[in-house]
């Protein structure tokens, strides 16, 4: 297993609709054809997996159908979007990148993006 540098923004504020997007960029030492991207959430020293996708270079990322993540890739960059976020989901979202094929296997883990989320104000009652 060889180490690889992964860069991501330090802080992102989610939209009022609970959507946050950020780029995860990795310094690929070779010509990987198969890449796995995993998003981990760290909150109060607990780490949980948010979503993961394996893709072939030049193809779209495909997350599971019920995943809250979507993404696109371009070269050594992965543009990740996390949807359905609530205030309670505020936390550090860490991008983990694995170069699966061809060997050697490389692993890189970013410092994390702190995603801040605020629940939208409830709409005032209106009479029709």
């Amino acid at each position: 297993c060889k180490a690889m540098h992964v860069a991501q923004p330090a802080v992102v504020l989610a939209s009022s609709r609970g959507i946050a997007s950020f780029v995860c960029e990795y310094a690929s030492p070779g010509k990987a054809t198969e890449v796995r991207v995993t998003v981990l959430r760290q909150a109060d020293s607990q780490v949980t997996e948010v979503c993961a996708a394996t893709y072939m270079m030049g193809n779209e990322l495909t997350f599971l159908d019920d995943s809250i993540c979507t993404g696109t890739s371009s070269g050594n960059q992965v543009n990740l979007t996390i949807q359905g976020l609530r205030a309670m989901d505020t936390g550090l979202y860490i991008c983990k990148v694995e170069l699966m094929y061809p060997p050697p296997y490389y692993l890189g883990i970013g410092n994390g993006t702190q995603i801040y989320v605020i629940d939208p104000e409830p709409c005032p009652d209106s009479d029709f």
């Epitope: 330090a10 802080v11 801040y116």
Partner: antibody, heavy 117, light 107 residues
Framework: QVQLVQSGPEVKKPGASVKVSCKAS????????IGWVRQAPGQGLEWMGW????????NYVQKFQGRVTMTTDPSTSTAYMALRSLRSDDTAVYYC??????????WGQGTLVTVSS | EIVLTQSPDFQSVTPKEKVTITCRAS??????LHWYQQKPDQSPKLLIK???QSFSGVPSRFSGSGSGTDFTLTINSLEAEDAATYYC?????????FGPGTKVDIK
């Protein structure tokens, strides 16, 4: 090293608007946010809101909603805070501060805004 | 919004004495509590992040502890240059908030 340099002092009449700038250097501007904090004479720190320089999303404290606008210009690594309909109790030192994973870490030197007729 | 309360409001201390300032949050904020020092006519400066982590360049006499709702800033062996107002700040949830401050002066 990280530096935030703010625009100079302003004197405004009640009802007017003010726009304070904050130029950042020493880090990748779009990787962080910029928050705005004010401090009335002899008082404590009051959080006003912040903007994510990464995507331009903003979060304002309800008290300032509708009266404040925070923007960024990534091409010059500068953040702006505009406050409208100024009142005498808006007289304060306005600070910009970098928002990182651990809340606010680095601060500007402050801009004194005086509202007086 | 999360309300932070600090105690005491004011403390007059002799040099080399130990100073303890407490900050209480209106609801649990984990360890997302940070401490700042502000001297007269200066900007605040970060001392402690995430309840107990010293910020770069901060003297070792400053330390922090706590989690959840109760937090403490300790200044071991106070020096004359430590005369300032100390604020706690939470970044657990938006909007961010500050405590009202604790003024420390030297006897």
């Amino acid at each position: 090293q990280v530096q935030l340099v703010q625009s100079g002092p302003e004197v405004k009449k009640p009802g007017a608007s003010v726009k304070v700038s904050c130029k950042a250097s020493g880090y990748t501007f779009t990787n962080y946010g910029i928050g705005w904090v004010r401090q009335a004479p002899g008082q404590g720190l009051e959080w006003m809101g912040w903007i994510s320089a990464y995507n331009g999303n903003t979060n304002y404290v309800q008290k300032f909603q509708g009266r404040v606008t925070m923007t960024t210009d990534p091409s010059t690594s500068t953040a702006y805070m505009a406050l409208r309909s100024l009142r005498s109790d808006d007289t304060a030192v306005y600070y910009c501060a970098r928002v990182g994973a651990s809340g606010v870490d680095y601060w500007g030197q402050g801009t004194l805004v005086t509202v007086s007729s | 919004e999360i309300v932070l309360t600090q105690s005491p409001d004011f403390q007059s201390v002799t040099p080399k004495e130990k100073v303890t300032i407490t900050c209480r949050a209106s609801q649990s904020i984990g360890s997302s509590l940070h401490w700042y020092q502000q001297k007269p006519d200066q900007s605040p400066k970060l001392l402690i992040k995430y309840a107990s982590q010293s910020f770069s360049g901060v003297p070792s006499r400053f330390s922090g502890s706590g989690s959840g709702t109760d937090f403490t800033l300790t200044i071991n062996s106070l020096e004359a240059e430590d005369a300032a107002t100390y604020y706690c700040h939470q970044s657990s949830s938006l909007p961010f908030t500050f405590g009202p401050g604790t003024k420390v002066d030297i006897k």
